[in-house]
Interface confidence: low
């Protein structure tokens, strides 16, 4: 069958790296500077991205695949194959439409990509907070009150927290 | 703000460097574009370079005759062989990074350009 | 190489009125198109971005819309100040898309 098929459409043929050339009967040519054919078969070859700008070459096009790209520091990727960079902000903060704001009081973000979350609500679990919460780190739970000690008390809970995924503008 | 200078009357086949200076923000931060705009014609873009990485990018009639470089607080424009045809007033532009994707960029931050006239 | 082409090169309508711009990209250029004003003596002014978002102090009355390869800028209720030249953009730098020009060739708007 393979026979047959390759008798029938010559360009099948053809191995990745290369392209069947209508213009010169149909034979196998190379892949020209700065594109690629990743499967055999190809009638034309596909221009290789270029990592522009923010985006950085993480492997470079050859004739039979792609380049590849990630972020400059500063930057992380975001989207299938990287199709963004986003930038980074610091622990404490989150990337709004504005830039970096720092976390609103009650939530935290322990990463330089991402939203500010809430603060665990240690009453849910009926615990109390052992370590106070900040702009970098969800607050420690610890036991129950009435697990504690006689004469020991727990630090104030937080402020109930607002909604996940709102970010300050 | 950005600041075009260096435009001034030369004879063709005299080389020309165009400087573009930013005050109010830092270079390294953001992508700058070179762009032309010949007397009564439409804008043509030259090229641009990322001041995070210095890479650069030009037009394929540019490349070869026009070099961009950066320094932490200007933009270079570097012009060889200069014939009638690149007659022009020439823009600097500084990105502003849009929708949160920073895979894209329009301009928003423009130079009052500088004029090139090049004849004999 | 991917070709920003515009259409009208020159419109003309009265105070008050509505002109269109199209502008249309030799291949899909997804929606990361822009829209500039520029008058005589001036440097561009970016009034849109992304097919759609006005940018900071750009009226309402510019708007942008299509997608992939068809974009167009409708300004209404024109105004004596919105006489300019217009520009399309194309900006999809991500991709492997290359631009020998990435503006189209410009629409004069004239207001009687």
């Known amino acids: 069958f393979e026979r047959t098929r390759s008798l029938q459409d010559p360009c099948s043929n053809c191995p990745a790296g290369t392209f069947c050339d209508n213009n010169r009967n149909q034979i196998c040519s190379p892949c020209p500077p700065n594109s690629f054919s990743s499967a055999g078969g190809q009638r034309t070859c596909d221009i290789c991205r270029q990592c522009k700008g923010v985006f950085r070459t993480r492997k470079e096009c050859s004739s039979t695949s792609n380049a590849e790209c990630d972020c400059t520091p500063g930057f992380h990727c975001l989207g299938a194959g990287c199709s963004m960079c986003e930038q980074d902000c610091k622990q404490g903060q989150e990337l709004t439409k504005k830039g970096c704001k720092d976390c609103c009081f009650g939530t935290f973000n322990d990463q330089k990509r991402g939203i500010c979350r809430p603060w665990t609500n240690c009453s849910l679990d009926g615990k109390s907070v052992l370590v106070n919460g900040t702009k970098e780190r969800d607050v420690v739970c610890g036991p129950s009150p009435a697990d504690l000690s006689p004469g020991a008390s727990s630090v104030t809970p937080p402020a109930p927290a607002r909604e996940p995924g709102h970010s300050p503008q | 703000s950005v600041e075009e200078s260096g435009g001034r009357l030369v004879t063709p086949g005299t080389p020309l460097t165009l400087t573009c200076t930013a005050s109010g923000f830092t270079i390294s931060s953001y992508h700058m574009i070179w762009v032309r705009q010949a007397p009564g014609e439409g804008l043509e873009w030259i090229g641009d370079i990322y001041g995070g990485t210095a890479t650069t990018d030009y037009a394929s009639w540019a490349k070869g005759r026009f070099t961009i470089s950066k320094t932490s607080t200007t933009v270079d424009l570097k012009m060889t062989s200069l014939t009638t045809e690149d007659t022009a007033t020439y823009f600097c532009?500084?990105?502003?990074?849009?929708?949160?994707?920073?895979?894209?960029?329009?301009?928003?931050?423009w130079g009052q350009g500088t004029l090139v006239t090049v004849s004999s | 190489d991917i070709v920003m082409t515009q259409t009208p090169a020159s419109v003309e309508a009265a105070v008050g009125g509505t002109v269109t711009i199209k502008c249309q990209a030799s291949?899909?250029?997804?929606?990361?198109l822009a829209w500039y004003q520029q008058k005589p003596g001036q440097p561009p002014k970016l009034l849109i971005y992304?097919?759609?978002t006005l940018e900071s102090g750009v009226p309402s009355r510019f708007k942008g819309s299509g997608s992939g390869t068809e974009f167009t800028l409708t300004i209404s209720d024109l105004e004596s100040a919105d006489a300019a030249t217009y520009y399309c953009q194309g900006y999809d730098w991500s991709s492997s898309n290359r631009y020998d020009n990435t503006f189209g060739g410009g629409t004069e708007v004239v207001v009687k």
């Open positions: 992304r097919t759609s």
């Open positions: 532009a500084r990105a502003r990074y849009s929708g949160g994707s920073y895979a894209n960029y329009v301009f928003n931050l």
């Open positions: 291949q899909s250029i997804s929606s990361y």
